[in-house]
């Protein structure tokens, strides 16, 4: 049995009431594809959220989050409180991160500093709240006599290919 | 309320030609099909042609090549301009709001009342 309603352009529902007529989508509504037996009720971006996109008839409207906030979840379904770099959200609010951590967005937890000596190099730089270390050459390579300075390349006759 | 007005239909000569016309009202007319249907004395209703929304269009094999269906979505009128005409297409000719913006095995919501065609030298 074929759909009679399947022809329906989005924008407009296939309307029961009126002996299956296509119909538009009332106001405050949408339908995002064709053959809708109804339209759904446009997502309202209130609080926390801000408007990004105006609901149309053929899409639902998207929602952002105010100053201060940034966005969870599949199509921003949630707004999640800003910290500060440094910081991250606890269920007490924005708490500091602990010595050996670091955040460096207003967003997401602490992370803790990268290991250099894991990898066999020193800390060129140390670690803050906001920054991770920055790792340097291996002590080995720092140690006297040891050259880190690379050779010059040997100079090449004019019109002379390499070997 | 759904209301359909058909007008343009008269005697004619065969070989002739007639432009029928269909004023609609009462509903979204651009985003739905339309149709014309016929009755000959004694005969059941049958499809002659459709329209859908995005103006592709569907033809009875009886009048391919010589009846064209059209619209006209600012003026809410959906038109069969009809030629070559035959004996056999005299009918009362109807107009017919389409279920679902369908040509293709079409269903009628609403019929308009009908506009006499007649062909006869």
């Known amino acids: 049995l074929q759909d009679l309603c399947s022809n329906c352009p989005a924008g407009t529902f296939c309307d029961n009431n009126r002996s299956q007529i296509c119909s538009p989508c009332p106001p405050n509504s949408f339908s995002s594809a064709g053959g809708q037996r109804t339209c759904d009720i446009c997502r309202q971006c209130k609080g926390v959220f801000k408007t990004r996109k105006e609901c149309s008839s053929t899409s639902n409207a998207e929602c952002d989050c105010i100053s201060g906030y940034h966005c969870l979840g599949a199509e921003c379904s949630m707004c999640e409180q800003d910290c500060k770099q440094g910081q991250e959200l606890t269920k007490k609010g924005c708490k500091d991160c602990c010595f050996g951590t670091f955040n460096d967005q207003k967003r997401g937890i602490c992370r803790p500093w990268t290991n250099c000596s894991l990898d066999g190099k020193s800390v060129l730089v140390n670690g803050t709240k906001e920054r991770d270390v920055v790792c340097g050459p291996s002590p080995a390579d720092l140690s006297p006599g040891a050259s880190s300075a690379t050779p010059p390349a040997p100079a090449r006759e004019p019109g002379h290919s390499p070997q | 309320e759904v209301q359909l007005l058909e007008s343009g239909g008269g005697e004619v000569q065969p070989g002739g030609s007639l432009r029928l016309s269909c004023a609609a009202s009462g509903f979204s007319f651009s985003i739905n099909a339309m149709g014309w249907y016929r009755q000959a004395p004694g005969k059941r209703r049958e499809f002659v042609a459709a329209i859908e929304s995005g103006r592709n269009t569907v033809y009875a094999e009886s009048v391919k090549g010589r009846f064209t269906i059209s619209r006209d979505n600012a003026k809410n009128t959906v038109y069969l301009q009809m030629s070559s005409l035959r004996a056999e297409d005299t009918a009362v000719y109807y107009c017919?709001?389409?279920?679902?913006?369908?040509?293709?095995?079409?269903?009628?919501?609403?019929w308009g009342q009908g506009t006499l065609v007649t062909v006869k030298p």
């Open positions: 017919g709001l389409l279920k679902g913006n369908r040509v293709v095995s079409p269903s009628v919501a609403y």
